[in-house]
């Protein structure tokens, strides 16, 4: 299908050198396309804003732990 | 790229145990939600168990509380699924993946699949 070919890439060239906390985090998305040059997690704000993130840094595997959890329901 | 390879698996008899093994290799392991789901003959594949990426949570579907125990080993890129008191009801394909994607449960967040390791329960 050309569109999915043709779909663009969001890549992350840098990361926050801040740790940002739980509570102003809304959602993540990974980045895991080989076009891109680092592996990253993009983080989403509470107020929209996208901030490109190490998943190597304890803190960014806690805080999609945190994100993780919020989603959780009842299994069966 | 991040590759999965499942081991442990086998015929046991119902009430024996069985301990699987998944060793990842290709990428950062603590970064990744780990979880192992199953099919069986002729059924959709289903969750069976979640561990976060510390380790420090982790939950189980109903049908296997109680009698199965998830665990990671970050050190070594390793996510276990101890199985006792096993029931011919478990046969399946055990399979391991690693989340990438925002979720918990639920199959289309996990991003990478190992090819799956059998496990009989003969009654």
């Known amino acids: 299908q050309p569109d999915a070919i043709n779909a663009p890439v969001t890549c992350c060239y840098n990361f926050t050198n801040r740790k940002i906390s739980v509570q102003r985090l809304a959602s993540y998305r990974r980045i895991t396309s080989s076009k891109c040059p680092k592996e990253a997690v993009i983080f989403k704000t509470i107020v929209a804003k996208e901030i490109c993130a190490d998943p190597k840094q304890k803190w960014v595997q806690d805080s999609m732990d945190h994100l993780d959890k919020q989603t959780q329901t009842p299994k069966t | 790229e991040v590759q999965l390879v499942e081991s442990g698996g086998g015929l046991v008899q119902a009430g024996g145990s069985l301990r699987l093994s998944c060793a990842a290799s290709g990428g950062t392991f603590s970064s990744y939600r780990m979880g192992w789901f199953r099919q069986a003959p002729e059924k959709e594949r289903e969750f069976v168990a979640v561990?976060?990426?510390?380790?420090?949570?982790?939950s189980y579907s109903n049908s296997v509380k109680g009698r199965f125990t998830i665990s990671r080993d970050n050190a070594k890129n390793t996510v276990y699924l101890q199985m006792n008191s096993l029931k011919p009801e478990d046969t399946a394909v055990y399979y391991c993946a690693a989340g990438a994607q925002m979720g918990w449960a639920e199959a289309s967040t996990y991003d990478y699949w190992g090819q799956g390791t059998q496990v009989t329960v003969s009654s």
């Open positions: 561990i976060t990426r510390s380790g420090g949570s982790h």
